[in-house]
Interface confidence: medium
Amino acid sequence: AGSCSLEGVEIKGGSFRLLQEGQALEYVCPSGFYPYPVQTRTCRSTGSWSTLKTQDQKTVRKAECRAVRCPAPVSFENGIYTPRLGSYPVGGNVSFECEDGFILRGSPVRQCRPNGMWDGETAVCDNGAGHCPNPGISLGAVRTGFRFGHGDKVRYRCSSNLVLTGSSERECQGNGVWSGTEPICRQPYSYDFPEDVAPALGTSFSHMLGATNPTQKTKESLGRKIQIQRSGHLNLYLLLDCSQSVSENDFLIFKESASLMVDRIFSFEINVSVAIITFASEPKVLMSVLNDNSRDMTEVISSLENANYKDHENGTGTNTYAALNSVYLMMNNQMRLLGMETMAWQEIRHAIILLTDGKSNMGGSPKTAVDHIREILNINQKRNDYLDIYAIGVGKLDVDWRELNELGSKKDGERHAFILQDTKALHQVFEHMLDVSKLTDTICGVGNMSANASDQERTPWHVTIKPKSQETCRGALISDQWVLTAAHCFRDGNDHSLWRVNVGDPKSQWGKEFLIEKAVISPGFDVFAKKNQGILEFYGDDIALLKLAQKVKMSTHARPICLPCTMEANLALRRPQGSTCRDHENELLNKQSVPAHFVALNGSKLNINLKMGVEWTSCAEVVSQEKTMFPNLTDVREVVTDQFLCSGTQEDESPCKGESGGAVFLERRFRFFQVGLVSWGLYNPCLGSADKNSRKRAPRSKVPPPRDFHINLFRMQPWLRQHLGDVLNFLPL
């Protein structure tokens, strides 16, 4: 290795940092600027830094930070745009208007962002005359072809030095949709923001997972039990670049990101096999889909953890062809094993995620390997859903846009090729991309966990139950038509036909109101049952079910929570098929103090700790100090039966009066499970406050200290099964 002097390597307007123990350097520019002409330089064995060369191979004397600019429209059909500039500065706007008779689709005003990309969507002036809609011309692109009938083709190219991503040719298909994906012309130095990539990647992935979802329900001839068929299977191939230009630290982030991906993908109710391949000059298969362990999340993550940066120290080139070819060989072996004509082979969907930091520089064109893969999987218009290739480049300047674009799949309304600024951005994307909440089926226990999600998106099962006027209780959707809540909400014997259940709705921040078709209130509930024993209020059997007058449409804002002891929850927990209710209890309530949550009046998720075993006893004992409600209590268990979970110690939040009936839930494997429902407590933090956001922490000197009791759903199984037997698939006790 060479030793290079740092003299004269500075960049005007920016800074640099050394990588790989001084064998490489990276230029860093402020937001809205990019390093010109390169982002990284390597120290050559001759002791000099690699030359500063532009894209057209001209040599530059000194690196500089240049202002990012966004490409100008080359042509805009059937309308006008203003202002008309050669290119646009960061923060600059361009506005579009249509001529009479044409309607604007897309964004009327677009702004140039600091990454050199326009915000919004391509503006198109369309009169709706064609079989397919006018496909438009993205900013900086030129289109040939102006007929939009079935079978017509349009071609795109980019002006000057812009790079095309997406499809250079699209065909109007019989279904009125253009083949491929919208072409976008971008500056060679542009990159994607994580917050754009995550949903784009997620949408595409959700489509694939939606298609692979095994919860297709078929009625059995005997009885009305619903059987879940495990049909779909997904092979996920993760390809991690380990070439010289990837630093050891970046490789670690590649591994972490891949682990996140694996973790998320296993939280879906699909059968999945994961292959792990690292590559530099040669690929190394760490896990093959032919290995049974590829179906086991722990095994896959462990093989990822064992991936070693030094595995490739003897060959440090970037041979993307060989990496993709090892996927092809794996597919070939699996096809031979299962039989080319069998459904078992033909029904497998395949997703390849390539994480790289640059161009392939050996082994031939990776496109050839992709062609082989498409061929073996018989990918045509009908089987387009069976293969998705995601090409993700990291490090904006030295990634070859053209190559990434060539490798990524082209599907209408989806993107499969991305360039991110750094590995940190990659980590962010993988954290947020798998947003199952977009799925429209009744998959349970899915909440949007991204930072910018609304409260209702985070807990989409949460509902408000109210008589005509004020809100009184909360509840949880446990299917698309049933709500679980507390019996004491109905103790005034109000006619429940006057009641409303407010369910989350993406179209309205106020939600959507549903009438109640029937209320099933536990017959064992009687708040005055023990009055003659000096127990003024008793909340045993404080459970009720409400059947809504209509089915709730599943969305990001409305979705059931998983109820333990059901097949649905078993799938979400990724437990084997013979699991029992006892197994669920042992897995979910497995510690002396189990972190859990409930939802506050203002919609936020608050934290509690459910006390189990010995700790349950000391948690409940405090009730004996409550002399107002229980003036002469001798045995705490007369009040706190084993039907109750106990919380309220340490820094726990206490539920307010109006939060009764709401779910007490835990998170496991990115899914949410209801283990209890809010019933009663010794302290109301909202007392004396009309403000939903105001909770008064119990004064530290309060006697007795706060305690909260929640109906334990594991103790209410017979009743739940009696009323929900036709709705949910219960496991044996």
Partner: antibody, heavy 118, light 111 residues
Framework: EVQLVQSGAEVKKPGASVKVSCKAS????????MDWVRQATGQGLEWIGD????????GYNQKFKGRATMTVNKSISTAYMELSSLRSEDTAVYYC???????????WGQGTLVTVSS | DNVLTQSPDSLAVSLGERATISCRAS??????????MHWYQQKPGQPPKLLIY???NLKSGVPDRFSGSGSGTDFTLTISSLQAEDAATYYC?????????FGQGTKLEIK
């Protein structure tokens, strides 16, 4: 409206005790903690302790533990703070203050000046 | 005990100008999603008056030129456009746990 009315000024000899009262009106007395705060002339505010009128349970600043005693008479909605073994440095204005839903002191009495002098 | 340190000890600001007072806690006053830090104004011969509760919430009846910000250990009281009646001593106070403590106070004068 919420009102806290304190007893009048007191002059005490070192070693004696003083008992300051605070009569509350305009709200349910047992719903909120009552705190006691003192302020020596030209000095800052110093928290003495609080009492939960419902359970008559107390929390004290360690500095006053053993010397300060807080009590309530629920029937007349009045809180009391007694400070014993008075010294000259206990000369101060003593305030009662009612906590609100956020554990802040939303309402204050007018203050009682206690002078300790031989 | 959680020690609250206000800065500056005193300041003089012209009418109509912005006044800013800081309060730093020796340990975090945040719990269960809220910052248990409050601000009071005290004029000579009067009891203190609550201005801001839970770090940033304006008590009803207090003019909106007063605002509070901060989280964890660092908090600020701002008076956006100083009026003559704002000359007073300002105290921060926490109620995160016992014992509650006050800052030493900041005397604000009109320049």
């Amino acid at each position: 409206e919420v009102q806290l009315v304190q007893s009048g000024a007191e002059v005490k000899k070192p070693g004696a005790s003083v008992k300051v009262s605070c009569k509350a009106s305009g709200y349910t007395f047992t719903d909120y903690n009552m705190d006691w705060v003192r302020q020596a002339t030209g000095q800052g505010l110093e928290w003495i302790g609080d009492i939960n009128p419902n359970y008559e349970s107390t929390g004290y600043n360690q500095k006053f533990k053993g010397r300060a005693t807080m009590t309530v008479n629920k029937s007349i909605s009045t809180a009391y703070m007694e400070l014993s073994s008075l010294r000259s440095e206990d000369t101060a204005v003593y305030y009662c203050a009612r906590e609100d839903d956020h554990d802040a002191f939303a309402y204050w009495g007018q203050g009682t000046l206690v002078t300790v002098s031989s | 005990d959680n020690v609250l340190t206000q800065s500056p000890d005193s300041l003089a600001v012209s009418l109509g100008e912005r006044a800013t007072i800081s309060c730093r806690a020796s340990k975090s006053v945040r719990t269960s999603g809220y910052n248990y830090m409050h601000w009071y104004q005290q004029k000579p011969g009067q009891p203190p008056k609550l201005l801001i509760y839970l770090a940033s919430n304006l008590k009803s009846g207090v003019p909106d030129r007063f605002s509070g910000s901060g989280s964890g250990t660092d908090f600020t009281l701002t008076i956006s456009s100083l009026q003559a009646e704002d000359a007073a001593t300002y105290y921060c106070q926490h109620s995160r746990e016992l014992p509650y403590t006050f800052g030493q106070g900041t005397k604000l004068e009109i320049k």
